[in-house]
């Protein structure tokens, strides 16, 4: 029997972000549930992490007296990421002088758990999503985004931090996963592959997408990122897969057209404010959700991941620009900046829609292999 596609009856479309290609699938095996070491041999296409204090430069951790109320997802201590032994060494991040806490990279020593023990945790991200095993949770309501349509001024900082391109977001972008689950957006960044090689972090039934966007949020229950790290629900990331489509995506073009200016590692530029929600799929009601971690050191757990069912379409030229413009340290291209998928270790991925059933009309009450645990909590 055909495996259901994630997209199924939810055509991509609406705004500049969606098209009606469903999320693809591939009959690739996934060792999602088998415990294993961080990024073991044979793990996915390429391991990696990002730059938050695990998810791309989380806001700077500063004494409260400094820049209060101005969270910058950036410059936290970072560590090296391990490589995938089955993949060519990704030299996007060459070793630098200095202690292990000063940086990390995709591919290579030291193993991430050695420099950030949380990276060896049992509930890490990213993961492989199997729609048929997802627990349908009707209590998962459509996401609510407020203040994401930014005016052109003030401008925003776009930075090549050596392992991703990151856009720092201003105060005022509010997101709710549900009643009482409120967050503030801090930054967004992307993960990508290389020519002919996909680079999303999450996978769907083993299928890796060309790229993935992450919008990182801090719970309103916390004033600072360092307070939220490792706390259940302290951070939340909205993730969407980027796919190739026939037309240029004008929302993404506002960022991609500026990448040449920040080709060099550590460089940054300013870009006009834009509609951040236009970078995401238009359907906020259909998504997968689970508790995981930052995908880069320090790999802090307790992060609520929301992965959209609908994908975002970019042109082939745009995807090429994304994967072929930026440079990391040591004269190496910044490519394949994703971490290998991690085992679920008993976690259940929840779905806001009946993802595990064929969309063709059948039983009114489809049987789900997993039951909803969250109850919208």
């Amino acid at each position: 029997q055909r495996l259901p596609r994630m997209q199924e009856d939810s055509p991509l479309g609406g705004g500049s972000s969606g098209e009606d290609d469903p999320l693809g699938e591939e009959d690739l095996p996934s060792e999602e549930d088998s415990p294993r070491e961080e990024d073991p041999p044979g793990e996915e296409d390429l391991p990696g992490e990002e730059d938050l204090p695990g998810e791309e430069d989380l806001p700077e951790v500063k004494p409260k007296s400094e820049e209060e109320g101005s969270l910058k997802l950036e410059d936290l201590p970072t560590v090296e990421a391990p490589g995938d032994p089955q993949e060519p060494q990704n030299n996007a991040h060459r070793d630098k002088e200095g202690d292990d806490q000063s940086h990390w990279r995709y591919g290579g020593d030291p193993p991430w758990p050695r420099v950030s023990p949380a990276c060896a945790g049992r509930f890490q991200s990213p993961v492989d999503i199997r729609p048929q095993l997802a627990a349908f949770c009707p209590a998962l309501r459509p996401l609510e985004l407020l203040g994401f349509q930014l005016p052109p001024l003030p401008e925003l900082r776009l930075r090549n931090n050596g392992h991703s391109v990151q856009l720092t977001l201003p105060p005022g972008l509010e997101m709710a996963l549900g009643p009482g689950r409120e967050y503030r957006a801090l930054q967004l960044h992307l993960h990508w592959g290389a020519a002919g090689r996909p680079g999303s972090e999450h996978t769907v039934e083993g299928h890796r997408f060309p790229a993935e966007i992450h919008v990182v949020h801090l719970s309103t229950a916390f004033a600072r990122v360092d307070e939220a790290l490792g706390r259940p629900g302290g951070l939340a990331v909205l993730a969407a897969f980027l796919e190739e489509g026939p037309e240029e995506n004008s929302a993404y073009e506002q960022l991609l057209s500026r990448l040449e200016e920040i080709a060099e590692e550590g460089s940054e530029t300013q870009v006009p404010g834009l509609d951040i929600s236009a970078l995401l799929p238009s359907d906020f009601s259909r998504y997968f959700q689970y508790e995981g971690s930052l995908t880069t050191p320090p790999c802090a757990q307790g992060v609520i991941w929301t992965v959209f069912n609908q994908t975002v379409m970019l042109s082939a030229k745009q995807l090429h620009t994304l994967s072929d413009t930026l440079w990391g340290p040591g004269d190496s291209r910044l490519q394949l900046n994703f971490r290998a998928t991690q085992p679920l270790n008993g976690r259940v991925i929840e779905a806001s829609f009946p993802a595990g059933v064929d969309s063709s009309p059948r039983a009114a009450e489809p049987v789900q292999l997993n039951s909803c645990l969250a109850a919208g909590d």
């Epitope: 500049s16 349509q149 052109p152 001024l153 004008s250 300013q270 870009v271 006009p272």
Partner: antibody
Framework: EVQLVESGGGLVQPGGSLRLSCAAS????????MHWVRQAPGRGLEWVAF??????????QYSASVKGRFTISRDNAENSLYLQMNSLRAEDTAVYYC???????????????WGKGTTVTVSS | DIQMTQSPSSLSASVGDRVTINCHVS??????LSWYQQKPGEAPKLLIY???NLHTGVPSRFSGSGSGTGFTLTIRSLQPEDYATYYC?????????FGQGTKLEIK
């Protein structure tokens, strides 16, 4: 009174250089993005370059047609804006306007104060 | 770059007429559009900002409307001093671009 006064225009040969100046008065100069906009004879308006305000680090931005040839700068102590034009071409012939646009309270770029303009003619 | 197309390129109208000038934008710019008036030998002057806000000192017969990709400048009752060329400009992202202009002439 808010005022912008340009100077430095003139006749120059192709490949030559020219430096335009703009004296600003009547407002807090450092708060504003400052632009150069040009208008070729009988033609429409073309944005050339801007330099950001203090809050945004005084960094420049250029149109593709002048990038690498023109340099915008400002002297905040003197409330002055400059446009250094090198490798001039016939198509750079235009009236050059110094323009104020965008500040800490703005939410987009509109050009609310214009100078009278200074004429640059590039011809052999 | 964002393309701006004004229509008509020129028009003739009489004093007291209601005049509308259109500006079509190649992509969604929300309301980040301005209108300018330029008389021969003078610098442009800002009339309307953020699609519909009247700039200080501009007569109330001028108004602007629209959002997204379609915008309109309206002069409710044309006055002799209104004969000029009008430009729209997007302030969504650089390079900032202007329409090609609409020349308003006396009928």
């Amino acid at each position: 009174e808010v005022q912008l006064v340009e100077s430095g225009g003139g006749l120059v040969q192709p490949g030559g250089s020219l430096r335009l100046s703009c004296a600003a008065s009547g407002f807090t100069f450092t708060d504003y993005y400052m632009h150069w906009v040009r208008q070729a004879p009988g033609r429409g308006l073309e944005w050339v370059a801007f330099i950001r305000n203090k809050a945004s680090g005084y960094t420049p931005q250029y149109s593709a047609s002048v990038k690498g040839r023109f340099t915008i700068s400002r002297d905040n102590a003197e409330n002055s804006l400059y446009l250094q034009m090198n490798s001039l071409r016939a198509e750079d012939t235009a009236v050059y306007y110094c323009v104020r646009g965008g500040h800490a309270g703005s939410n987009y770029w509109y050009f609310d104060v214009w100078g009278k303009g200074t004429t640059v003619t590039v011809s052999s | 770059d964002i393309q701006m197309t004004q229509s008509p390129s020129s028009l003739s109208a009489s004093v007291g007429d209601r005049v509308t000038i259109n500006c079509h934008v190649s992509q969604n710019i929300n309301v980040w559009l301005s209108w300018y008036q330029q008389k021969p030998g003078e610098a442009p002057k800002l009339l309307i900002y953020q699609a519909s806000n009247l700039h200080t000192g501009v007569p109330s017969r001028f108004s602007g409307s629209g959002s997204g990709t379609g915008f309109t400048l309206t002069i409710r009752s044309l006055q002799p001093e209104d004969y000029a060329t009008y430009y729209c400009q997007q302030g969504q992202s650089y390079p900032f671009t202007f329409g090609q202009g609409t020349k308003l002439e006396i009928k």
